[in-house]
């Protein structure tokens, strides 16, 4: 496929990535699926600068990102290394809290109202952000 050189309609370009901000809520798995079907992924935050950009666009609203520990260790959906990467958890988070009464702990990460991260029940219907890199090979064939 060809390299994607500009962002799709309704996506926002920033630092060679394209971002799409939902205005409705979905469970984490549905949000993840939506992004994949758009040839993208849930947002992966790799720097303080990217954190501030996303935070500016989402406002003080709980919003899913592409980080989870549903299979044990924390993982970014695009394979970015969690241990050595950027983190912005709230104090005492993640805590895998079981006291919510919904069964199980908390396995999916989201931006909170102040932008810092919290782990929460993956079934909660939060907004989400998709991201795709401009310089990656697109799945669409080049236009002739």
């Amino acid at each position: 496929g060809s390299e994607r050189t500009c962002c799709p309609v309704n996506w926002v370009e920033h630092e060679r990535s394209c971002y799409w901000f939902s205005r409705s809520g979905k469970a984490w798995a549905d949000a993840d699926n939506y992004c994949r079907l758009e040839d993208a992924h849930l947002v992966v935050v790799t720097s303080w600068e990217e954190q501030k950009f996303v935070q500016h666009h989402i406002g003080p609203v709980n919003t899913w990102m592409g980080l989870h520990d549903q299979n044990g260790p924390w993982k970014w959906v695009d394979g970015t290394d969690y241990e050595t990467g950027f983190k912005n958890w709230r104090p005492e988070q993640p805590d895998d809290w079981y006291g919510h009464g919904l069964g199980g702990g908390e396995d999916c990460a989201h931006f909170t109202d102040d932008g810092r991260w919290n782990d929460d029940v993956c079934q909660r219907p939060y907004r989400w952000v998709c991201e795709t890199e401009l310089d990656k090979a697109s799945q669409e064939p080049p236009l002739l």
Partner: antibody, heavy 119, light 112 residues
């Protein structure tokens, strides 16, 4: 038991708009994604797009410029519009329910409706 | 998009024998985030819509006989029908749902 039924004109003229509706019975349309898939005679299957009850959509990139999907939760229906049709759009059109689990495979299908594009 | 290629296009198998259909994707449909393969198999009989047989590459849909089995990972997948029955005559399709969904061209299964 969930049942899906496609309805709409069986004949559409070239350059016009194909419009179909899927009615869901035996269960609520809520909390699922719903897709349209088509199959030209004697050929394979092509996914057109999906919608949920809040109106969130994904479309096949190859058809995106011509497709619009909508939903009417009060009638337990969702609809497809495909503009600027040509003979290549002649096919059996199926509506289908997504299996859930954050995954776009299809566990319930309508029987399909044949749409012919011809003048 | 992801291109799905099935082989063979058609095959004839004796009743009670084993039928094997292969499906190859143009890129991996294994999601490293959850270690799941985003692949499904369907059966379609003449004049009917497709019927879901297998999802997640190897999980059998409720009510599907256990003679149907899915296997494989990454880009290479197989549907195996053990002890073929007359009612298994149909066209079989694989489908990836890792990205915008796409189907294989189909494999027509007949009785020899």
């Amino acid at each position: 038991q969930v049942q899906l039924q496609e309805s709409g004109p069986g004949l559409v003229k070239p350059s016009e708009t194909l419009s179909l509706t899927c009615t869901v019975s035996g269960g609520s349309i809520s909390n699922y994604y719903w897709s349209w898939i088509r199959q030209p005679a004697g050929k394979g299957l092509e996914w057109i797009g999906r919608i949920d009850t809040s109106g969130i959509t994904n479309y096949n990139p190859s058809l995106k410029s011509r497709v619009t999907m909508s939903v009417d939760t009060s009638k337990n229906q969702f609809s497809l519009k495909l503009t600027s049709v040509t003979a290549a759009d002649t096919a059996v059109y199926y509506c289908a329910r997504e299996g859930g689990l954050g995954a776009t495979f299809f566990d319930y299908w309508g029987q399909g409706t044949l749409v012919t594009v011809s003048s | 998009g992801i291109v799905m290629t099935q082989s063979p296009d058609s095959l004839a198998v004796s009743l009670g024998a084993r039928a094997t259909i292969d499906c190859k994707s143009s890129q991996s449909v294994l999601y490293s985030s959850n270690n799941k393969n985003y692949l499904a198999w369907y059966q379609q009989k003449p004049g009917q819509p497709p019927k879901l047989l297998i999802y997640w590459a190897s999980t059998r849909e409720s009510g599907v006989p256990d003679r149907f089995s899915g296997s494989g990972s990454g880009t290479d997948f197989t549907l195996t029908i053990y002890s073929l029955q007359a009612e298994d005559v149909a066209v079989y399709y694989c489908q990836q749902y890792y990205r915008s969904p796409s189907f294989g061209q189909g494999t027509k299964l007949e009785i020899k």
